[in-house]
């Protein structure tokens, strides 16, 4: 994909519960198994029809998560973490970081792109800054007729 | 998504091997469990064998022991089923299967609801 996509930046926490076929997703990721560049994150792969996740409704493809009931999931072999994931118990916690693509453009596949992203607040500082400058001016030309 | 495309099916006499291909476009390939599934006429599909994302895992049916040998070769983008041996109740559709990442649930190699992108498949005869 060609040009800088910049995306939005959240943070989730979401309470699983593992239900009879468990939690129901995939991943990718892991020290040796790299899917976004310069990030060895632990991402979702796939969501599973009729599976926890899927019925939760909040967990989506794309998404990366950073813990497992509180336990960081950095600089994990892909096969450690999966681990992590089954013994995990019966109710799971996810902290989970999504990503919204922000700007125009074709949508592409996301693995091993740029993860780099920009947060919310770089973008709409400087659109309220504009605003009110813009305000400020209008109100001095009307006080000024 | 990738996309597969199996090949190397064809007509072959009992005892004889065959080798099949299957080609995934896309350059996620590495990401994916593959696996091998074939359906003769009026039967169930059933499970052939399977391989891990890395090649460090690999996973046969009980009907294919000692005889299959399943294999891949990332940089081609390419997983192979060598079949030797061959018998005529070997004779179906030979489908490849992919899944995108590896479950966090227990993981059933067997079970087709595990992948997520399937190939048409080709056809393999033993007389």
């Known amino acids: 994909m060609n040009g800088r996509v910049d995306y939005l930046v959240t943070e989730e926490e979401i309470n699983l519960t593992r239900g009879p076929s468990g939690l129901g997703f995939n991943i990718v990721g892991g020290t040796d198994q790299q899917y976004v560049s310069n990030d060895s994150g632990i991402y979702v792969s796939r969501i599973k029809e009729n599976g926890a996740a899927a019925l939760d409704g909040r967990l989506q493809e794309g998404d990366k998560i950073l813990s497992v009931n509180g336990q960081d999931l950095k600089n994990l072999l892909h096969q450690d973490a999966v681990d992590l994931f089954r013994n995990a118990g019966y109710a799971v916690s996810l902290r989970v970081q999504h990503r919204l693509q922000v700007q125009n453009g074709p949508i592409g596949h996301r693995g091993e792109g740029d993860p780099s992203g920009i947060p919310i607040f770089m973008v709409l500082v400087p659109v309220f800054a504009l605003t009110m400058v813009a305000a400020w001016a209008f109100m001095r030309y009307r006080q000024q007729l | 998504d990738v996309q597969l495309v199996e090949s190397g099916g064809g007509l072959v006499q009992a005892g004889g091997s065959l080798r099949l291909s299957c080609a995934a476009s896309?350059?996620?390939?590495?990401?994916?469990?593959m696996g091998w599934f074939r359906q003769a006429p009026g039967k169930e599909r059933e499970f052939v064998s399977a391989?891990?994302?890395?090649?460090?895992?690999?996973y046969y049916g009980d009907s294919v022991k000692g005889r299959f040998t399943i294999s891949r070769d990332n940089a081609k983008n390419t997983v192979y089923l060598q079949m030797d041996s061959l018998k005529p109740e070997d004779t179906a559709v030979y489908y490849c299967?992919?899944?995108?990442?590896?479950?966090?649930?227990?993981?059933?190699?067997?079970?087709?609801?595990?992948?997520?992108?399937w190939g048409q498949g080709t056809q393999v005869t033993v007389s």
């Open positions: 299967a992919g899944a995108f990442g590896s479950t966090v649930d227990n993981y059933d190699p067997s079970d087709p609801r595990e992948y997520d992108t």
């Open positions: 896309g350059r996620t390939f590495r990401y994916y469990s």
């Open positions: 391989i891990s994302w890395s090649g460090d895992s690999t």
